[in-house]
Interface confidence: medium
């Protein structure tokens, strides 16, 4: 139903706390360089205005759209051009072009320093003094670094953060209470960020239809007892929610997500037997819980998929009459039978099925032509299964750090033109798939591995889009989202690459490396490894291992030395000489 004042409607639906949080996230995701104080001031102004509209919906400007209200606020910021350059040109446009312009200027890799966690004492003092300001800082810092973070989910993580601080700040040893718990939240939030970015990429590049197909597959796997009409309804609603969030309409997105959660909990009987635990929780926890609820038990009496989609004499007639619905039912039926497949694989199979019908239904004897389609799925299924087996075996053999290094070598050989920091970030993230997925039961490994890799590779594509340097990467990133991972996996050494000259300073280290946290040390070593591969792209695994072992030994020796600086300055050049010899 239409509301006289959109802002009053959303304020009433969401309540003041969530309203303020979402407005702060929206502003932080649009203007990523502004300080917390600048945004907090704007949020307060918007909230005060919303309250006047709640009191009187026909008050001045209360009938304006949220884009108009928010855009006007952003465009009134002083020194916009000095701080944001051409983004200021957006302010010369009218809605909806102005909002589209803001969206196009979101930066997936803003030049902000890493978000460092304060000392436990500092956090607790700060949190106790003013929990609202503390959580505001958290929302602001995460949102500006992750401009597509799923806003209602970010409110959930802020709530988790809040609960952890409340609990741990009352403990004697705050540090050991906080560290593992906050590390856990951080890890989950980072994965959530890359997954959501993938959804927004799907929406932006391929439109709602592509996202809806993704949603149908995912929901069918999770709710195999729900009928196709129910799955379609849920997929349509979920598509709307994600479209709104990806489009910067965060108040609508959060409101519609709450509605969707409410609907699911009121219709458990026709959706899934596994929802009750989630539905007993408060709003943010409920919606989060529903988004990762375990798969319902598959119906025992499902007929073979071939009956309706291969053996039926009316296949081409059904397809011609309503292509999208017929393909949708195929995707639904195949997905509900295969919770052990990744969504990417299911979409590839649906695509293969569609291509087969397009070809065969135009021929003289269609059944003879499409009769073998299910057999033709076999290589498509085997490829990711082999990928999982090979990579999990390697992970189990090498451990996370060693596995990351193996991936780093592989990807540097595939795309040596890509900047070393991007390669290291990608390899570290890709390498985490082992810890995340390889320890799961067999039937959960494939969906975990492939869908996670796809999300990480989407980030590689987004970063590469900004400064394209590798034809290999451009090729894989230009195709459809579901074909990206197989494309990257199939890449081999880039033969067109001219190796980098050997620069001694790239491999020169100083004693400051000794005091770095373990993660930073690893990054330094991985940076050196990528540079070695760029110098010798065809170096064997054995050669690289020799050099890296020597390097590790050198660091260990010098970091234990009484006079570290002298050790680094005398042993360093020897290490560089040995490296050159080993790779000659």
């Amino acid at each position: 139903e239409a509301h006289k004042s959109e802002i009053a409607h959303r304020y009433n639906d969401l309540g003041e706390q969530h309203f303020k949080g979402l407005v702060l996230i929206a502003f932080s995701q649009y203007l990523q360089k502004c300080s917390y104080d600048e945004h907090a001031k704007l949020v307060q102004e918007v909230t005060d205005f919303a309250k006047t509209c709640v009191a009187d919906e026909s008050a001045a400007n209360c009938d304006k759209s949220l884009h108009t209200l928010f855009g006007d606020k952003l465009c009134a910021i002083p020194n916009l051009r000095e701080n944001y350059g051409e983004l200021a040109d957006c302010c010369t446009k009218q809605e909806p072009e102005r909002n589209e312009c803001f969206l196009q200027h979101k930066d997936d890799n803003p030049s902000l320093p890493p978000f460092e966690r304060p000392e436990a004492e500092a956090m607790c003092t700060s949190f106790k003094e003013n929990p609202t300001t503390f959580m505001g800082h958290y929302l602001h810092e995460v949102a500006r670094r992750h401009p597509y973070f799923y806003a209602p989910e970010l409110l959930y993580y802020a709530e988790q953060y809040n609960e952890i601080l409340t609990q741990c700040c009352a403990e004697a040893d705050k540090e050991s209470c906080l560290t593992p718990k906050l590390d856990g939240v951080k890890e989950k939030a980072l994965v959530s960020s890359v997954r959501q970015r993938m959804k927004c990429s799907s929406m932006q590049k391929f439109g709602e239809r592509a996202f809806k197909a993704w949603a149908v597959a995912r929901l069918s796997q999770t709710f195999p007892n729900a009928d196709f009409a129910e799955i379609t309804k849920l997929a349509t609603d979920l598509t709307k929610v994600n479209k709104e969030c990806c489009h910067g309409d965060l108040l609508e997105c959060a409101d519609d997500r709450a509605e969707l959660a409410k609907y699911m909990c009121e219709n458990q009987a026709t959706i899934s037997s596994k929802l009750q635990t989630c539905c007993d929780k408060p709003l943010l926890k409920k919606a989060h819980c529903l988004s990762e609820v375990e798969h319902d038990t598959m119906p025992a009496d499902l007929p073979a998929i071939a009956a309706d989609f291969v053996e039926d004499q009316e296949v081409c007639k059904n397809y011609a009459e309503a292509k999208d619905v017929f393909l949708g039912t195929f995707l639904y039926e195949y997905s509900r039978r295969h919770p052990d497949y990744s969504v990417s694989l299911l979409l590839r199979l649906a695509k293969k099925y569609e291509a087969t019908l397009e070809k065969c239904c135009a021929e003289a004897n269609p059944p003879a032509c499409y009769g073998t389609v299910l057999a033709e799925f076999q290589p498509l299924v085997e490829e990711p299964k082999n990928l999982v087996k090979t990579n999990c075996d390697l992970y189990e053999k090498l451990g996370e750090y060693g596995f990351q290094n193996a991936i780093l070598v592989r990807y540097t050989q595939k795309a040596p033109q890509v900047s070393t920091p991007t390669l290291v970030e990608a390899a570290r993230n890709l390498g985490r798939v082992g810890t995340k997925c390889c320890t799961l039961p067999e039937d959960q490994r494939l969906p975990c591995v492939e869908d996670y890799l796809s999300a990480i590779l989407n980030r590689v594509c987004l970063l590469h889009e900004k400064t394209p340097v590798s034809e290999h990467v451009t090729k894989c990133c230009s195709g459809s989202l579901v074909e990206r991972r197989p494309c990257f996996s199939a890449l081999t050494v880039d033969e067109t690459y001219v190796p980098k000259e050997f620069k001694a300073e790239t491999f020169t280290f100083h004693s400051d490396i000794c005091t770095l946290p373990e993660k930073e040390k690893q990054i330094k070593k991985q940076t050196a490894l990528a540079e070695l591969v760029k110098h010798k792209p065809k170096a064997t695994a054995e050669q690289l291992k020799t050099v890296m072992d020597d390097f590790a030994q050198f660091l260990d020796t010098c970091c234990k030395a009484a006079d570290k600086d002298t050790c680094f300055s005398t042993e360093g050049p020897n290490l560089v000489t040995r490296c050159k010899d080993a790779l000659a």
Epitope: Y36, L112, P113, E116, R117, E119, E121, A122, M123
Partner: nanobody, 124 residues
Framework: EVQLVESGGGLVQAGGSLSLSCAAS????????MGWFRQAPGKEREFLAG????????FYGDSVKGRFTASRDSAKNTVTLEMNSLNPEDTAVYYC?????????????????WGRGTQVTVSS
């Protein structure tokens, strides 16, 4: 908001010492990491030293390690930078800055609030 005012700059002979002070006022001081930076004409702003909110951790830039000492008096809301063995290369405008939180911040972009700076000139 946090307001920061530096004092103690001036002219000093090479090899001499100087003590800079930074007074903070405004929003509660305690959850901030305080940092000292300097900027010479035509050069980038350089991190010198930082003190976490409790004064429990101090950390330094490579160029001043062993010569400069930062400390903090939370009760008086002041931070001090003691500078010894000064040389002409230390000539610059010295800034005090505050970063919300308690991290070991070295990047100027991590700092939310800045003082106006105080000139230090070291003559040979």
């Amino acid at each position: 908001e946090v307001q920061l005012v530096e004092s103690g700059g001036g002219l000093v002979q090479a090899g001499g010492s100087l003590s800079l002070s930074c007074a903070a006022s405004g929003r509660t001081f305690s959850p901030y990491t305080m940092g000292w930076f300097r900027q010479a004409p035509g050069k980038e702003r350089e991190f010198l030293a930082g003190v976490t909110w409790s004064g429990s951790s101090t950390f330094y830039g490579d160029s001043v390690k062993g010569r400069f000492t930062a400390s903090r008096d939370s009760a008086k809301n002041t931070v001090t930078l003691e500078m010894n063995s000064l040389n002409p290369e230390d000539t610059a405008v010295y800034y005090c800055a505050a970063a919300y939180g308690g991290g070991l911040y070295r990047d100027p972009r991590s700092y939310d609030y800045w003082g106006r700076g105080t000139q230090v000139t070291v003559s040979s």
